[in-house]
C-alpha cells in the first residue's frame, strides 16, 4: 500500500512557509511530500479553495529503481507581484488512494507603504467656483492617514482635523496643484500631483444693445477670472434654422459657427454684414492666459427688416389714349425684408404728382384725366417693406403706343448705388 493511506500518517515532509511583503513583491511557497508508488498531483489551496490557475511547478524524484519505491515530490507556487487578493492561508492538497491529505498552512501577508486606490486628477475649474478632489489609500497595515497639500503645502495637519477621502475646495483664484500624502506604520507615500487650472467664469447677461438690418451690437458681463486678466472674448454666431434645434443648453449647433474675437474691455462687439430680417443664434466665451471659459447658452437674436436697397427693374410705361399701362419687375437689389408691395407716382409737366399703392402686383393700368392731353407724363415706382420705401426709380416717360409695335421698354441707366454686401461679416 502507498505511504500515507492511513488517516493519521501525512505524506508531507515540508510545509509552505510564510511570506509577508509589500505590493509587487515576488515570492515562492514550497511543499514537499514522500510517497510510495506513483506520485500524485499536488494541488494548492488558498483559504480552503483550490487554486485552478495556480502558477505552480511540480518536481518528482524517484528514490529507487522500482516504480513502487518511494518518490520525493516538490511543488512550488510562485506569487508574482503580490497584491491584496493574494493574501491568505496556503496549503498543499493531495489525493492518495481514497484519502485526502492537506499540508500544514503557510501564510501570505501584505504589509508595506500605503497604496493609492484613488488619486487627485487634473481638471479645470471656473474661478471662485467650489469643487471636490478625491484621494483614497489603503494598507495593510491600517489605518492610513491622509494629508492634503495645496501647492505642496499642507492644508490641515492636526490628526482627525483634516479632510480624508474627499477635499472640498471652496474656490480658487489661481491655478494650483493638489496632492495627498498617505501615512501608515510602514511609511509615507505621496500621490500624483493634480493641476487644477483656473479658467474664467462663464460670461453672463449676453444681450442686444442695438439692431440694424445688417448689424447687431451685443454686450455681455464678464465672469471672474481670478488673478488672470481676460485677454479676449470670442463670439460665435450661426444662422438659425427652424430644424436646427439649438436649445438653451445644447453644446454645439449642427453647422460650423462663424467666429469673431473681441478685445476686452469693452465687453461689447458690433457684428456687421449680416443678413437683414434673419434669425441668428449667438454665444460668447472669454479667455485668460489659462484658457477659455465655458460658452454662454445660445441666445436667439434677429436682424430687423430694412428697406429695399434698389428700385424695381425694367419699368415700361406706354400710353394709349386716356390709358397708360405700366409694368415692372422686382428689384434685383436685396429687399432686406418681406416685400409688402409697390408704390407708383406719376406726374405731368404742369400737373400735381399722383401717388398710388399698387400692392404686390407688378403692373397697373392708369386712367388719365383730361382726355390724355397731359404732356410729358412720367412714372416712378418704388418697392416697400415693413421698414419703409426703397429708392424710387428714375422717372420713365410715357411712350405713345402704336399698333403693331411692341411696348417700349426703358432700361434704367442709373440706379442709386447699393452698399457692398459681403458675407461673412468677420
Amino acid at each position: 500500500a502507498p505511504r500515507g493511506t492511513q488517516a493519521e500518517e501525512s505524506p508531507f515532509v515540508g510545509n509552505p512557509g510564510n511570506i509577508t511583503g509589500a505590493r509587487g513583491l515576488t515570492g515562492t511557497l514550497r511543499c514537499q511530500l514522500q510517497v510510495q508508488g506513483e506520485p500524485p498531483e499536488v494541488h494548492w489551496l488558498r483559504d480552503g479553495q483550490i487554486l485552478e490557475l495556480a502558477d505552480s511547478t511540480q518536481t518528482q524524484v524517484p528514490l529507487g529503481e522500482d516504480e513502487q519505491d518511494d518518490w520525493i515530490v516538490v511543488s512550488q507556487l510562485r506569487i508574482t507581484s503580490l497584491q491584496l487578493s493574494d493574501t491568505g492561508q496556503y496549503q498543499c492538497l493531495v489525493f492518495l488512494g481514497h484519502q485526502t491529505f492537506v499540508s500544514q498552512p503557510g501564510y501570505v501577508g501584505l504589509e508595506g507603504l500605503p497604496y493609492f486606490l484613488e488619486e487627485p486628477e487634473d481638471r479645470t475649474v471656473a474661478a471662485n467656483t467650489p469643487f471636490n478632489l478625491s484621494c483614497q489609500a489603503q494598507g495593510p497595515p491600517e489605518p492610513v492617514d491622509l494629508l492634503w497639500l495645496q501647492d505642496a503645502v499642507p492644508l490641515a495637519t492636526a490628526p482627525g482635523h483634516g479632510p480624508q477621502r474627499s477635499l472640498h475646495v471652496p474656490g480658487l483664484n489661481k491655478t494650483s496643484s493638489f496632492s495627498c500624502e498617505a501615512h501608515n506604520a510602514k511609511g509615507v507615500t505621496t500621490s500624483r500631483t493634480a493641476t487644477i487650472t483656473v479658467l474664467p467664469q462663464q460670461p453672463r447677461n449676453l444681450h442686444l444693445v442695438s439692431r440694424q438690418p445688417t448689424e447687431l451690437e451685443v454686450a455681455w458681463t464678464p465672469g471672474l477670472s481670478g488673478i488672470y486678466p481676460l485677454t479676449h472674448c470670442t463670439l460665435q454666431a450661426v444662422l438659425s434654422d427652424d430644424g436646427m434645434g439649438i436649445q438653451a443648453g445644447e453644446p454645439d449647433p449642427p453647422e460650423e459657427p462663424l467666429t469673431s474675437q473681441a478685445s476686452v474691455p469693452p465687453h461689447q462687439l458690433r457684428l456687421g454684414s449680416l443678413h437683414p430680417h434673419t434669425p441668428y443664434h449667438i454665444r460668447v466665451a472669454c479667455t485668460s492666459s489659462q484658457g477659455p471659459s465655458s460658452w454662454t447658452h445660445w441666445l436667439p437674436v434677429e436682424t430687423p427688416e430694412g428697406v429695399p436697397l434698389g428700385p424695381p427693374e425694367n419699368i415700361s410705361a406706354t400710353r394709349n389714349g386716356s390709358q397708360a399701362f405700366v409694368h415692372w419687375q422686382e428689384p434685383r437689389a436685396p429687399l432686406q425684408g418681406t416685400l409688402l408691395g409697390y408704390r407708383l407716382a406719376y406726374q405731368g409737366q404742369d400737373t400735381p404728382e399722383v401717388l398710388m399703392d399698387i400692392g404686390l402686383r407688378q403692373e397697373v393700368t392708369l386712367e388719365l384725366q383730361g382726355d390724355g392731353s397731359v404732356s410729358n407724363l412720367t412714372v416712378c415706382v418704388a418697392a416697400y417693406t415693413a421698414a419703409g420705401d426703397g429708392p424710387w426709380s428714375l422717372p420713365v416717360p410715357l411712350e405713345a403706343w402704336r399698333p403693331g409695335q411692341a411696348q417700349p421698354v426703358h432700361q434704367l441707366v442709373k440706379e442709386p448705388s447699393t452698399p457692398a454686401f459681403s458675407w461673412p461679416w468677420w
Epitope: L113, P143, D145, L146, L147, L149, D151, A152, V153, P154, A156, T157, A158, P159, H161, G162, S177, S179, E181, H183, N184, A185, G187, V188, T189, T190, S191, R192, T193
Partner: antibody, heavy 115, light 107 residues
Framework: EVQLVESGGGLVQPGGSLRLSCAAS????????IHWVRQAPGKGLEWVAG????????YYADSVKGRFTISADTSKNTAYLQMNSLRAEDTAVYYC????????????WGQGTLV | DIQMTQSPSSLSASVGDRVTITCRAS??????VAWYQQKPGKAPKLLIY???FLYSGVPSRFSGSGSGTDFTLTISSLQPEDFATYYC?????????FGQGTKVEIK
C-alpha cells in the same frame, strides 16, 4: 521666527548611548513633524528618522532601525533621538529639520550637533 | 529604497554663468523632489520643493524642473554667494533619500 536648536551631541564609545534633543520655537509640534538627518564628515546627507505630522507613527532608516528611537514632547515643543548601540559609522553631524509634509521639503533646519 | 543620482559630482563655474545640475531617480517620483544648498559648516537650506516651487525668500535665479525620473536645478546667473554644495532629495516616499551632492566651485 522659526528656530530649531539641537543639543546632546558628544564623544561616545562604540556600543554606548546618547540622547539628542531638538528644541523648536516659532511654531508648535501640533500638526508638524520632525526629521533627523545626519552627515558623516566629508559625506552627503542621510535621512535617519522622522515623526510625521499626522498619525502616531515613527519611521527609521534601515541602518538605525532597532537601535534609535525618535520621540517628541509636545508640551516642551522638543523632539528627541535616543541612540543606543552606537557604532563608529554613526559618527556624523546630526540635524533636526521641520516636517510639515514630505512634499514640502525640509524647510527649517537646526545648526547641527556632532556625535 | 529610491536611489537619487546627481550629476556632475562637482563643477567649476564663473560668476554670471548659467549652471545646471541634474538628478535622476531610480523610479518614478512624479514631481516629489526638493533641492537644497549647503555651505561648509552650515545646515542645508531649502531652495526648491515639489520639483518646481521656489521656496519663500530664495532668489528667482534658482529654478527647478522635471517630473518622473529626471530633474534639473538651474542657476540662471551664478552669484558669489552661490558657491556651495547642492543636494536633490526625493519626497515621494519614505525613506526620503538624497543625491550624493554637486559641489559648485569658483573657476
Amino acid at each position: 521666527e522659526v528656530q530649531l536648536v539641537e543639543s546632546g551631541g558628544g564623544l561616545v564609545q562604540p556600543g554606548g548611548s546618547l540622547r539628542l534633543s531638538c528644541a523648536a520655537s516659532g511654531f508648535t509640534f501640533t500638526g508638524t513633524g520632525i526629521h533627523w538627518v545626519r552627515q558623516a564628515p566629508g559625506k552627503g546627507l542621510e535621512w535617519v528618522a522622522g515623526i510625521p505630522p499626522v498619525g502616531s507613527y515613527t519611521y527609521y532608516a534601515d541602518s538605525v532601525k532597532g537601535r534609535f528611537t525618535i520621540s517628541a514632547d509636545t508640551s516642551k515643543n522638543t523632539a528627541y533621538l535616543q541612540m543606543n548601540s552606537l557604532r563608529a559609522e554613526d559618527t556624523a553631524v546630526y540635524y533636526c529639520a521641520r516636517w510639515r509634509s514630505l512634499s514640502s521639503g525640509m524647510d527649517y533646519w537646526g545648526q547641527g550637533t556632532l556625535v | 529604497d529610491i536611489q537619487m543620482t546627481q550629476s556632475p559630482s562637482s563643477l567649476s563655474a564663473s560668476v554670471g554663468d548659467r549652471v545646471t545640475i541634474t538628478c535622476r531617480a531610480s523610479q518614478d517620483v512624479s514631481t516629489a523632489v526638493a533641492w537644497y544648498q549647503q555651505k561648509p559648516g552650515k545646515a542645508p537650506k531649502l531652495l526648491i520643493y515639489s520639483a518646481s516651487f521656489l521656496y519663500s525668500g530664495v532668489p528667482s535665479r534658482f529654478s527647478g524642473s522635471g517630473s518622473g525620473t529626471d530633474f534639473t536645478l538651474t542657476i540662471s546667473s551664478l552669484q558669489p554667494e552661490d558657491f556651495a554644495t547642492y543636494y536633490c532629495q526625493q519626497s515621494k516616499t519614505t525613506p526620503p533619500t538624497f543625491g550624493q551632492g554637486t559641489k559648485v566651485e569658483i573657476k
